[in-house]
């Protein structure tokens, strides 16, 4: 009987045309939404005149569908086994699962003015990005309507830069009509130990924004994972998003809708300093911000953003060192509301609930020769938002899968 | 020691065009920024435009109408200022200088070359 | 655009004097005034540099203070060779803007 259900198993989680794997992989049954909180800063003035702590205040969640769309340009390769295909993005924006609208206005750190003074750190170069966002009254804190800090404004300081530059900013721009990848993962029709095991990404098994193993493409997206999960095992995936590989590890045993599911979270370890887990090594990019590698829970993502100081941490800088979160009051960490944890069907190896969670922050340094940044006297990793993006089996699918799959075998 | 070198200038008429080098013999010539700057009869000197080392990002005060270019060749360790539209004011000795690697302005200066503008 | 006011126009001092030039910045430019001496017939030498810095090789008489928009250059003991046009240049922010000068003559 075993035997029987592994083989049914082993076919139908092959990502071929035909399979329930296929089906639920080009475009996912389950709705997938992303919520996000963003940190509307209560004392701009303090900050930039007194280098003061800043007093953040979260506001949210404002909700997003997300994942929507089928992947596009779905292509198999006979020969090596492997699926290729882009992932499009979009978002719509759900008014009654939000706290208010895209028209809600937030006090913000200048995005541009951040990244502009972190990329040009030549004095010379400094004192002419100074005239212009003089000139143009923009200062080292903003107000933006939801909307544009997510999906991108036209920056007034930006443009009156008299060179080709990209003038409009915003975390998330470009993402409607925009797709990640190429990704190429392979179908696991010679070897379902492979599947969905990604081989390729934007045509290479390397990201070039890291040292050594760090830089290496692990795993698999995290919507699936090879079939027969062991509690043992460490789940390996590569997420876009923050531009690397990353990890989760067993936790406990949870029923999802009557079936059986391992929760998989993403352990402190994985965002520990070299320090404490030297595996970690290759992630320390810079040794000043870092505090010579021993400062953690904060990944400096620059190199895979054209050099803006971006760095991702886990919401509210849960698992980061008391320094990244000393200079911003006002944040509560806690493992329930802010890790990430993903919840597999072992058999199958399925994700069917998941809540991924992370934040985004910016970096702004003290610039002698930037007046609006001139008072600062210290670096800050500044939380922008956090996002918490989550989905769950529908009841319908979940009765399927029970009566299908975990019903057979129990 | 740097040396800057400079040439091109002259007497010239109002309206005409005039094309400033200033050569220098440092090895390290692209990672400098460099910068035109001028001293009048009245002995004002004024900055007339500024390059940063690869040539990418130029600078021109407001006071100078962008009637002037500022350009560089870094493989031939040459700094330009192409000037046209000339006007009497703007007779002037022009120098070219180098800003110090910490960003300081003007570090070191050439000997300058004389433009007469004048009818 | 920051203005800057030098004083005085010209100034004959004997050999021995101490020298004072001041430079008055219209708008608050930290330590970031730099000071040039200009000998006739040649360009003009960096002496000071921002951050009241006297630039290696340039004797100790000179000196500099100040801070905000209140600066003063100073030559403790005049030497002939001393000789030369002064000019203060504020490079806080652009456009930079120079002093219109001091012309130092031997009494």
């Known amino acids: 009987g075993d035997l029987l259900i592994q083989k049914t198993i082993k076919k139908q989680v092959v990502l071929e045309e035909g399979t329930i794997a296929f089906k639920n992989w080009v475009k996912t049954g389950t709705e997938v939404y992303r919520q996000f909180w963003i940190f509307d800063v209560q004392n701009p003035q303090e900050v930039m005149m007194n280098s003061s702590n800043i007093q953040v205040k979260q506001r949210g969640p404002y909700t997003y569908r997300v994942r929507f769309l089928a992947k596009e340009n779905v292509t198999q390769d006979a020969e090596d086994n492997t699926v290729s295909f882009l992932q499009p993005n979009g978002a719509i924006f759900e008014p009654s699962l939000s706290v208010g609208t895209e028209a809600d206005n937030f006090t913000v750190l200048n995005l541009a003015v951040a990244a502009a003074s972190h990329i040009y750190q030549n004095q010379f170069v400094q004192m002419i990005l100074n005239s212009l966002i003089n000139k143009s009254k923009s200062s080292m804190f903003q107000v933006r309507t939801l909307r544009e800090l997510l999906w991108g404004y036209r920056d007034p300081f930006l443009s009156l830069v008299p060179y080709p530059v990209t003038t409009t900013v915003g975390l998330f721009y470009p993402y409607n009509n925009t797709a990640d990848g190429v990704y190429k993962v392979f179908n696991g029709k010679d070897n379902i130990s492979k599947v969905a095991i990604i081989d390729t990404y934007k045509g290479k098994r390397n990201l070039s924004y890291w040292e050594s193993h760090c830089d290496m493409i692990n795993g698999t997206d995290a919507a699936s994972f090879p079939p027969f999960v062991e509690k043992s095992q460490v789940l390996q995936f590569f997420s876009s998003d923050i531009c690397r590989s990353i990890y989760a590890v067993f936790e406990s045993d949870v029923n999802l809708k009557g079936i059986p599911v391992y929760r998989f979270v993403l352990p402190s370890k994985a965002f520990a300093s070299p320090v404490e887990n030297p595996d970690n090594y290759c992630f320390c990019t810079e040794k000043i911000i870092s505090k010579n590698c021993t400062s953690y829970g904060v990944l400096d993502i620059s190199k895979c953003k054209e050099g803006r100081p971006v760095y991702i941490s886990l919401p509210h800088f849960l698992y980061a060192s008391p320094d990244v979160s000393e200079p911003i009051d006002g944040l509560n960490p806690n493992e329930e509301e802010h890790r990430t944890y993903l919840d597999i069907e072992p058999i199958t190896g399925f994700t069917l609930q998941f809540a991924k969670r992370l934040q985004v922050n910016l970096l702004v340094k003290p610039s002698e020769k930037i007046q609006v940044l001139k008072n600062l006297k210290r670096n800050y990793i500044v939380p922008i938002l956090w996002l918490n993006e989550t989905g769950t089996i529908g009841d319908e699918k979940a009765n399927m899968f029970r009566s299908q799959v975990t019903g057979k075998i129990n | 020691e740097v040396q800057l070198v400079e040439s091109g200038g002259g007497v010239v008429q109002p309206g005409e065009s005039l094309k400033l080098s200033c050569e220098s013999n440092?090895?390290?010539?692209?990672?400098?920024?460099m910068s035109w700057v001028r001293k009048t009869p009245e002995r004002r000197l004024e900055l007339v435009a500024a390059?940063?080392?690869?040539?990418?990002?130029?600078y021109y005060p407001d006071t100078m109408e962008r009637r002037f270019i500022i350009s560089r060749d870094n493989t031939k360790k040459t700094l330009y200022l192409q000037m046209s539209s000339l006007k009497s004011e703007d007779t002037a000795m022009y120098y070219c200088?180098?800003?110090?690697?910490?960003?300081?302005?003007?570090?070191?200066w050439g000997q300058g070359t004389l433009v007469t503008v004048s009818a | 655009e920051t203005t800057v006011t030098q004083s005085p126009a010209s100034l004959s001092m004997a050999i021995g004097e101490k020298v004072t030039i001041r430079c008055i910045t219209s708008?608050?430019?930290?330590?970031?005034m730099n000071w040039y001496q200009q000998k006739p017939g040649e360009p003009p030498k960096l002496l000071i540099s921002?951050?009241?810095t006297l630039r290696p090789g340039v004797p100790s008489r000179f000196s500099s203070s100040g801070y905000g928009t209140d600066f003063v250059f100073t030559i403790e003991n005049m030497l002939s060779e001393d000789v030369a046009d002064y000019y203060c240049?504020?490079?806080?922010?652009?456009?930079?803007?120079f002093g219109a000068g001091t012309k130092l003559e031997l009494k």
């Open positions: 200088a180098r800003h110090g690697q910490t960003g300081t302005w003007f570090a070191y």
């Open positions: 440092e090895y390290e010539f692209p990672s400098h920024d």
């Open positions: 390059i940063n080392s690869d040539g990418a990002i130029t």
């Open positions: 708008t608050d430019i930290d330590d970031d």
């Open positions: 921002e951050g009241n």
């Open positions: 240049l504020q490079s806080d922010n652009l456009p930079l803007t």
